[in-house]
Interface confidence: low
């Protein structure tokens, strides 16, 4: 139960990519404001986004403290201008979020091909190791730092003159593939955590093709 002029938040949804994590909810407030609390299963509640008229709250700073923990959030509704007011049960109206485990659930952001280098009939394709907001010893960790060998990349490559794609996988950020001499190739990569059951794959990177600026070519 709550006060007559407030409504409980609903559709609480976690939106998370590379650990940048925002809780969203409805409805847009009319004469009310929200405060969010977040907790691990065993921890204390911590308040964030105090008395906001937004319908989202950035909880990244909290979840990056331990991305393997499971988090729960709740959104409190208060009458605008009277945030001390409580419901008949002596507390403001609130709604719980689904549980969220960042390591298992954060979406993988679109990767970027950093470079490719041809040496004879071999091409080395390097994927940019994207920085996350997860910190260790005051430095930001890369996606690879966080996921280690749980993270792989799939490379799709094809001759510019045809549509038949080949694939390769790596659990580093580099591929070394064989190509036909004198042929130009195009490349796209996808980040994958195959051991996951949800949010296993990123969207494909932008396509990069040989003969464009990104590459470097050395014939032997």
């Amino acid at each position: 139960s709550g006060t007559t002029n407030t409504v409980a938040a609903y559709n609480l949804t976690w939106k998370s990519t590379n650990f940048k994590t925002i809780l969203e909810w409805e409805p847009k407030p009319v004469n009310q404001v929200y405060t969010v609390q977040i907790s691990t299963k065993s921890g204390d509640w911590k308040s964030k986004c105090f008395y906001t008229t937004d319908t989202e709250c950035d909880l990244t700073d909290e979840i990056v403290k331990d991305v393997k923990q499971t988090y729960l959030a709740r959104v409190f509704s208060y009458p605008a201008g009277n945030v001390e007011s409580t419901g008949s049960a002596g507390e403001p109206l609130y709604e719980n979020s689904p549980e969220f485990t960042p390591y298992l659930e954060t979406n993988l952001g679109q990767p970027t091909i950093q470079s490719f280098e041809q040496v004879g009939t071999k091409v080395n394709v390097t994927v940019e190791d994207e920085r996350t907001l997860v910190r260790r010893n005051n430095t930001f960790l890369s996606l690879r730092d966080v996921f280690g060998k749980d993270l792989i990349y799939t490379l799709y490559y094809w001759k510019s003159s045809s549509s038949g794609k080949k694939t390769a996988k790596t659990n580093t950020n580099e591929f070394l593939i064989d190509v036909d001499k004198g042929e130009n190739y195009c490349f796209s990569v996808q980040a994958v955590i195959p051991s996951r059951t949800v949010n296993r794959k990123s969207t494909d990177s932008p396509v990069e093709c040989m003969g464009q600026e990104k590459g470097e070519f050395r014939e032997i």
Epitope: L104, A168, T197, V198
Partner: antibody, heavy 118, light 107 residues
Framework: EVQLVQSGAEVKKPGASVKVSCKAS????????MNWVRQAPGQGLEWMGE????????TYNQKFKARVTLTVDQSTNTAYMELSSLRSEDTAVYYC???????????WGQGTTVTVSS | SIVMTQSPKFLAVSLGERATINCKAS??????IAWYQQKPGQSPKLLIY???NRYTGVPDRFSGSGYGTDFTFTISSLQAEDVAVYYC?????????FGGGTKVEIK
Amino acid sequence: EVQLVQSGAEVKKPGASVKVSCKASGYSFTGYYMNWVRQAPGQGLEWMGEINPSTGGSTYNQKFKARVTLTVDQSTNTAYMELSSLRSEDTAVYYCARRELGGPFGYWGQGTTVTVSS
Amino acid sequence: SIVMTQSPKFLAVSLGERATINCKASQSVSNGIAWYQQKPGQSPKLLIYFASNRYTGVPDRFSGSGYGTDFTFTISSLQAEDVAVYYCQQDYSSPWTFGGGTKVEIK
């Protein structure tokens, strides 16, 4: 430490069903696909199917699709494989196996021997 | 489904010598190949994945190579504890399929 502990050996009559369990520990059960592989005496390995413990969705080898059912119990971190209409050629060791990054099976149960005999 | 053909079925090698097993896929599986070791009365054990990557804790005498349809698994210097049956498996396309196995013995 990741462990997959399977139920004990079974002896069944032709036409009966058998249900083998696989209790997982040491990792997030819903975070990895669970697969079932069988091995007839003196034979090679044969993949039967896999289940997503998070959703219960499963994929089967067409050969077994009509007779095998994969289920999970998230509350006990246990996967189950039920094979119906048993025949003598189903006599085999049945393994559960956790699928790792990229697809290989990194952790295996100890195996459950199922003997089908009249 | 993809058929994996493994050869030879039996391989006898002297201690300290090289053992080589081949696996051929009926269609391209990229580098989606794993290799397993199975000792008598035991469950299979993952040795190699992505055709050439050693799994955690696997000694470096075990190696793999290949791409597309043709793959090779090598034990560079056979030890007594390597006596086992070895299987290739494609994890490129469901249904996941295994080779028929190669029994490695000491000559």
